[in-house]
């Protein structure tokens, strides 16, 4: 089944329903393949094709493709956060796995029977793919869990999570993401947040906001949070330093537009 979590914090998504779909614009008329929006999105959008840049916040790669940082990428997770991955053929992924990920634990997890590990079907490793394979052993077994309701935000997806305890571990969220002074305040906030998240054992939704950053680490004009039940989240406009700009918010279906502001 799809019970086997991956290596890091896991976003659990709730089912899309008619109310969530009512938030969606009609899907693009001309698409080689339609997929759901990133993260826990409900609306359909065009899949990325082979060779296109991709990342954690971008559209998903199409069937049979995986979003992967290049093999010589010094900071692969950061590359995915930045959208500097590439949609590559799934067959190439296995060659990258040993480089990018620690080896999964050996079969035999105390909390799961053999039947559990082999009964269902799960998706093979990818940042943004809809291709599935019937091999649960692609998934390292349970790890850190975040409970996040699916939200829909046009610009990006925000995750709001709760946590019961916070680790005092000062280790960076990975050796590849040492803080760099040229990064802006948004990137620093994001990395601080992810630092905390990485070492929590169980998370459930109450208070961490992962901000929407541009490539230079400053705040993107539009910031959003997911709402309950995957309804469109509350959005607001900020300047490049993350300061809210008055007069630009939305709590309903209508989109907030932040075009006039300079925050990139």
């Amino acid at each position: 089944g799809a019970s086997s979590a991956g290596l890091g914090p896991v976003v659990r998504c709730e089912p899309c329903d008619a109310r969530a779909l009512a938030q969606c614009a009609p899907p693009p008329a001309v698409c080689a393949e339609l997929v759901r929006e990133p993260g826990c999105g409900c609306c359909l959008t065009c899949a990325l094709s082979e060779g296109q840049p991709c990342g954690i916040y971008t559209e998903r790669c199409g069937s049979g493709l995986r979003c992967q940082p290049s093999p010589d990428e010094a900071r692969p997770l950061q590359a995915l956060l930045d959208g500097r991955g590439l949609c590559v053929n799934a067959s190439a992924v296995s060659r990258l796995r040993a480089y990018l990920l620690p080896a999964p634990p050996a079969p035999g997890n105390a909390s799961e029977s053999e039947e559990d590990r082999s009964a269902g079907s799960v998706e093979s490793p990818s940042v943004s793919s809809t291709h599935r394979v019937s091999d649960p052993k692609f998934h390292p077994l349970h790890s850190k869990i975040i409970i996040i309701k699916k939200g829909h935000a046009k610009d990006s997806q925000r995750y709001k999570v709760d946590y019961e305890s916070q680790s005092t571990d000062t280790q960076n969220f990975s050796s590849e993401s040492k803080r760099e002074t040229e990064y802006g305040p948004c990137r620093r906030e994001m990395e601080d947040t992810l630092n905390h998240l990485k070492f929590l054992n169980v998370l459930s939704p109450r208070g961490v906001h992962i901000p929407n950053c541009d490539k230079k680490g400053f705040y993107k004009k539009k910031q959003c949070r997911p709402s309950k039940g995957r309804k469109r989240g509350f959005c607001w406009c900020v300047d490049k330093y993350g300061q809210p700009l008055p007069g630009y918010t939305t709590k309903g279906k209508e989109d907030v537009h932040c075009y006039s502001m300079q925050s990139k």
């Epitope: 799809a2 998504c13 329903d17 559990d116 009964a119 269902g120 998240l197």
Partner: antibody, heavy 130, light 106 residues
Framework: EVQLVQSGAEVKKPGASVKVSCKAS????????ISWVRQAPGQGLEWMGW????????NYAQKLQGRVTMTTDTSTSTAYMELRSLRSDDTAVYYC???????????????????????WGQGTMVTVSS | DIVMTQSPSSLSASVGDRVTITCRAS??????LNWYQQKPGKAPKLLIY???SLQSGVPSRFSGSGSGTDFTLTISSLQPEDFATYYC????????FGQGTKVEIK
């Protein structure tokens, strides 16, 4: 063996309530959701609702809103479906089914939207008759 | 709600025949389409998920295809144990089933 075992058949009068149980074994209960599906005699399958065994969140079919309540007891790995204000057209076999959790792994990029009903209970016949 | 329409509602076939069942969604559901087999007095059994992925333990004579609104379940060579009712199910927006296709012995 992964299985869902449901409670026995029930005969109820119109206006009464019924509570059907579904006991899971052979897998980590909280890693999945449970959906309930019913099938009237000689008819097709009708989805009734879903509950997350992880956090108890629910999503019910519109036509049953207000009459159905789904719950779980993680200590016994059991899901429950209660249907109130029973009518004759609620006569059906009621099934529970396991639903994998959709999830996205932030760090490794693992992603699954696999949410088909992969394991089913044997069914519970509920007859509503005066 | 998304409405799933199966055709035909029933069909007669012989052992060894190639059988095709179609399912149409009232709106695009990408590849969020599953197929189930149900025999009289039994619970349904998952055959195909995500439009074309074969569930573990299901014989390879079963295959699924399609994307968007039109989907097909194919049984390449019908076996005696395949006479049953088949249901499609969309899982894009919660879940809804098609009305079923009964495959009978000719």
């Amino acid at each position: 063996e992964v299985q869902l075992v449901q409670s026995g058949a029930e005969v109820k009068k119109p206006g009464a309530s019924v509570k059907v149980s579904c006991k899971a074994s052979g897998y980590t209960f909280t890693s999945y959701g449970i959906s309930w599906v019913r099938q009237a005699p000689g008819q097709g399958l009708e989805w009734m609702g879903w509950i997350s065994a992880y956090n108890g969140n629910t999503n019910y079919a519109q036509k049953l809103q207000g009459r159905v309540t789904m719950t779980t007891d993680t200590s016994t790995s059991t899901a429950y479906m209660e249907l109130r204000s029973l009518r004759s057209d609620d006569t059906a076999v009621y099934y529970c089914a396991r639903v994998p959790s959709e999830y996205y792994d932030f760090w490794s990029g693992y992603y699954t939207e696999e949410n088909a009903f992969d394991i089913w209970g044997q069914g519970t016949m509920v007859t509503v008759s005066s | 709600d998304i409405v799933m329409t199966q055709s035909p509602s029933s069909l007669s076939a012989s052992v060894g025949d190639r059988v095709t069942i179609t399912c149409r969604a009232s709106q695009s559901i990408s590849s969020y389409l599953n197929w189930y087999q149900q025999k009289p007095g039994k619970a349904p059994k998952l055959l195909i998920y995500a439009a074309s992925s074969l569930q573990s333990g299901v014989p390879s004579r079963f295959s699924g295809s399609g994307s968007g609104t039109d989907f097909t379940l194919t049984i390449s060579s019908l076996q005696p144990e395949d006479f049953a009712t088949y249901y499609c199910q969309q899982s894009y927006s919660t879940w809804t089933f098609g009305q079923g296709t009964k495959v009978e012995i000719k």
